[in-house]
Amino acid sequence: ARARNGDHCPLGPGRCCRLHTVRASLEDLGWADWVLSPREVQVTMCIGACPSQFRAANMHAQIKTSLHRLKPDTVPAPCCVPASYNPMVLIQKTRTGVSLQTYDDLLAKDCHCI
């Protein structure tokens, strides 16, 4: 099947690849020396297993799933990664004071297996 598979997780609710939110401080992230604000970030990230054809991003991911079943020691299972991102703006320290900087690949928006 060429189409991306559905979102039914055969491992049980919440076990497969999906978006998780983790609250983290600048210290947790190791950013305290260069970021001033926000002091706390709701980090959205992709976590979970990628069982057979679950949220397969493309044909390559489908092939990887099939080959992983045949040769699990050589071919790893697909990985749960961001499919797209939400942008975020940070207030940063600069040599002359403070500035704004936007990052377009900091927070996961949705997830897939690849």
Epitope: S37, P87, V89, L100, D104
Partner: antibody
Framework: EVQLVQSGAEVKKPGESLKISCKGS????????IGWVRQMPGKGLEWMGV????????IYSPSFQGQVTISADKSISTAYLQWSSLKASDTAMYYC????????????WGQGTLVTVSS | QSVLTQPPSVSGAPGQRVTISCSGS????????VNWYQQLPGTAPKLLIY???NRPSGVPDRFSGSKSGTSASLAITGLQAEDEADYYC??????????FGGGTKLTVLG
């Protein structure tokens, strides 16, 4: 309910000083940045600057740097925009707006404060 | 002059579909996001679309946003009289930080 309530309309003479306010309620005031936006009569929106009420870090648009001062008092959940010497060209509607969680958009706006500067 | 270019006005009859364009450059829309605001006559702006295509709760699904290359557009389907307003796009620019388009006045005919 998130609300930003701004101070009332002001009529001033050129050269006078002014401080307008924006009081936030219904959310944690220090967890979200506040921006100020100018709208001159019959014109579009212009971003003036932003403040992080928690650390009082401020960043200004290059067009407004040195022209205005943005500040905040987190103990009373209020942000301010002030001028030390008003000009006739400062006549405009001024809006405060709360930034969304990621700092990329304005999710709630105050009702606006109309400032008229005329001799 | 605005960094983001919008048509000054668009119009449509009730029930029709209209689109409002917002043209930028590689230093703003081309690499980042676009947000849209609606400003009804005599009122403060209101967030309509954020991060290109996301609707805040309470915004009808008649409003949708999209982005392609250095341009973005706002589409309104099933146009209603109460949609008559000014619409602004907003993005980020490396030199000016937060930037707005010049605004588009939407007139609902008839």
């Amino acid at each position: 309910e998130v609300q930003l309530v701004q101070s009332g309309a002001e009529v001033k003479k050129p050269g006078e000083s002014l401080k307008i306010s924006c009081k936030g309620s219904g959310y944690s005031f220090t967890s979200y940045w506040i921006g100020w936006v100018r709208q001159m009569p019959g014109k579009g929106l212009e971003w003036m600057g932003v403040i992080d009420p928690d650390g009082s870090y401020t960043i200004y648009s290059p067009s407004f740097q040195g022209q205005v001062t943005i500040s905040a008092d987190k103990s009373i959940s209020t942000a301010y925009l002030q001028w030390s010497s008003l000009k006739a060209s400062d006549t405009a509607m001024y809006y405060c707006a709360r930034y969304g969680r990621y700092g990329t958009y304005f999710d709630y706006w105050g009702q606006g404060t109309l400032v008229t500067v005329s001799s | 002059q605005s960094v983001l270019t919008q048509p000054p006005s668009v119009s449509g009859a009730p029930g029709q579909r209209v689109t409002i364009s917002c043209s930028g450059s590689s230093s703003n829309i081309g690499v980042l996001y676009v947000n849209w605001y609606q400003q009804l006559p005599g009122t403060a702006p209101k967030l309509l679309i954020y991060s290109n295509d996301n609707r805040p709760s309470g915004v009808p699904d008649r409003f949708s946003g999209s982005k392609s290359g250095t341009s973005a557009s706002l589409a309104i389907t099933g146009l209603q009289a109460e949609d008559e307003a000014d619409y602004y796009c907003q993005s980020w620019d490396s030199s000016s930080n937060y930037v707005f388009g010049g605004g588009t006045k939407l007139t609902v005919l008839g």
